[in-house]
């Protein structure tokens, strides 16, 4: 992907970009591409949206192949129609304490984030808002009729919290780490981010990890057993290699992925861990990236909804990491 060669673009004409996404030249000044947005993977050839003040953050200098689109230092955040300064903390609602950092918002739940799986005495657990209470509570009732076309895919789900205690104090530093955000893709390779000050200087920093809830090419519905409506964690028949912008993982992984349901439920990561994965690129360069690995998935009716800006963006996130 070096820029010294002659420019040649894909045979198709310039792409049509979604509303609000800029059509820009790639990093070599060669081809017109849709600019990558905040939190998306970027490369020299796939640049971030310059009109939104984004740049491609490659992390360590050794990994100058693939980065994450990041807002420039000190960029404010627009959240729910309000502008917050970088470094400013705010309570978005009674449920969340949030922090703005360089254009990205990280939030920590103030309500219990437990997961209730179906059980014989409560086959259809559901969170409901009770009058006069901020935090939702679990209730058990019969499900409403679900009208669903095809399987419900989701990358979002409340996960058990296994991260550091958010109130932990270390050497005059109140260590705070927001939960990992939902994977940016419901299938294929995506990005998950969080904000933390769990470092030597106690400074807020953004962390990111690769994530894959399920492969896009897998036809998971076919594996649902007769009489069942879900496949929670489908068996992956053979170890796979991960691909990232033309680079391939050096090791093969017998990774777990989340399945699908045909009754409107979403299957999403329940317990995860973060491990480094080494990718080898065609030019021989090796880069190391942190990646989410799924330990367990859960299928539930608590699927993302777009009726509440905050709920849809931040409520159904992947909570924590287990060691």
């Amino acid at each position: 992907q070096n820029c010294s060669g002659p420019c040649r673009c894909p045979d198709e004409p310039a792409p049509r970009c979604p509303a609000g996404v800029s059509l820009v030249l790639d990093g070599c000044g060669c081809c017109r591409v849709c600019a990558k947005q905040l939190g998306e993977l970027c490369t020299e050839r796939d640049p971030c949206d310059p009109h939104k003040g984004l740049f491609c953050d490659f992390g360590s200098p050794a990994n100058r192949k693939i980065g994450v689109c990041t807002a420039k230092d000190g960029a404010p955040c627009i959240f729910g129609g309000t502008v917050y300064r970088s470094g400013e903390s705010f309570q978005s609602s009674c449920k969340y304490q949030c922090t703005c950092l360089d254009g990205a918002v990280g939030c920590m739940p103030l309500c219990s984030m437990d997961v209730r799986l179906p059980s014989p005495d409560c086959p259809f657990p559901r969170r409901v808002k009770l009058p006069g209470k901020c935090c939702e509570e679990w209730v058990c009732d019969e499900p409403k009729d679900q009208t669903v076309v095809g399987p419900a895919l989701a990358a979002y789900r409340l996960e058990d919290t296994f991260g550091p205690d958010p109130t932990m104090i270390r050497a005059n530093c109140l260590v705070q780490t927001t939960e990992w955000s939902a994977c940016s893709k419901t299938c294929g390779m995506g990005i998950s981010t969080r904000v933390t000050n769990d470092n030597a200087s106690c400074r807020l920093e953004k962390q990111s990890r690769l994530c894959m809830v399920r492969p896009c090419e897998a036809d998971l519905e076919e594996n649902i057993k007769k009489g069942k409506k879900c496949i929670r964690t489908p068996k992956i028949s053979k170890p796979i290699k991960f691909e990232l912008s033309g680079c391939t993982s050096m090791k093969t992984y017998r990774a777990k992925f989340c399945g699908v349901c045909t009754d409107g439920r979403c299957c999403t990561p329940h317990r995860t861990t973060t491990l480094p994965v080494e990718f080898k690129c065609p030019d021989g360069e090796v880069m190391k990236k942190n990646m989410m690995f799924i330990k367990t998935c859960a299928c539930h009716y608590n699927c993302p909804g777009d009726n509440d800006i905050f709920e849809s963006l931040y409520y159904r996130k992947m909570y924590g990491d287990m060691a």
């Epitope: 010294s4 060669g5 002659p6 420019c7 040649r8 030249l25 000044g29 060669c30 081809c31």
Partner: antibody
Framework: EVQLVESGGGLVQPGGSLRLSCAAS????????MAWVRQAPGKGLEWVAN????????DLLESLKSRFTISRDNAKNSVYLQMNSLRAEDTAVYYC????????????WGAGTTVTVSS | DIVMTQTPLSLSVSLGDQASISCKSS???????????LEWYLQKPGQSPQLLIY???SRASGVPDRFSGSGSGTDFTLKISRVEAEDLGVYYC?????????FGQGTKLEIK
């Protein structure tokens, strides 16, 4: 009809300068790269330079980089070749060509303009 | 620089016969995107060049199917299955995969 028309050629003394122009019509100019190719009398074709859609990237023959500059004005549907410190070996017919930037390179050519460098 | 060497430099063919021109590159002309940008141009007497073939074997718009291109790596060939009077002129191969972009020295096709 897709058309490229070159102008600005002529007789110039060694060390002199010329600015060639190429006026495009019949297509969306800003959707194409443009290029200059030259042909010395009785000789073959030689690529000189090309320029991307908006002029932010230019590539030139290494031996000409210090003397030649390619530029474009999308508002005027024109591409230019500024030639300085001209030498006798720069004598040639200079063709303006459309570069698709995709599958093929030069799919449309102008008729050419003659540059003669002589004292 | 990549040198494009054409053979023969001159070719005399009877109308209706097949003509074949070879072009060899001094090194591989595979672009970093995996495509091979090998093209053929025809310059008729007193005219500007015109594109015949691009990406080794794709015919440009309006080019008769008697023209065909083939090859890979460093060896490429242009074939004219049934030569017509309008085909006379100088044929140039061209590589656009590496800088500097280079043309072959040309092959002059004459009609017997």
């Amino acid at each position: 009809e897709v058309q490229l028309v070159e102008s600005g050629g002529g007789l110039v003394q060694p060390g002199g300068s010329l600015r060639l122009s190429c006026a495009a019509s019949g297509f969306t100019f800003s959707d194409y790269y443009m290029a200059w190719v030259r042909q010395a009398p009785g000789k073959g074709l030689e690529w000189v330079a090309n320029i991307n859609y908006e002029g932010s990237r230019t590539d030139l023959l290494e031996s000409l980089k210090s003397r030649f500059t390619i530029s474009r004005d999308n508002a005027k549907n024109s591409v230019y070749l500024q030639m300085n410190s001209l030498r006798a070996e720069d004598t040639a017919v200079y063709y303006c060509a459309r570069d698709t930037s995709r599958g093929s390179y030069f799919d449309v050519w102008g008729a050419g303009t003659t540059v003669t460098v002589s004292s | 620089d990549i040198v494009m060497t054409q053979t023969p430099l001159s070719l005399s063919v009877s109308l209706g016969d097949q003509a074949s021109i070879s072009c060899k590159s001094s090194q591989s002309i595979v672009h970093y995107n995996g495509n091979t940008y090998l093209e053929w141009y025809l310059q008729k007497p007193g005219q500007s060049p015109q594109l015949l073939i691009y990406k080794v074997s794709s015919r440009a718009s309006g080019v008769p199917d008697r023209f065909s291109g083939s090859g890979s790596g460093t060896d490429f060939t242009l074939k004219i299955s049934r030569v017509e009077a309008e085909d006379l002129g100088v044929y140039y191969c061209f590589q656009g995969s590496h800088f500097p972009l280079t043309f072959g020295q040309g092959t002059k096709l004459e009609i017997k």
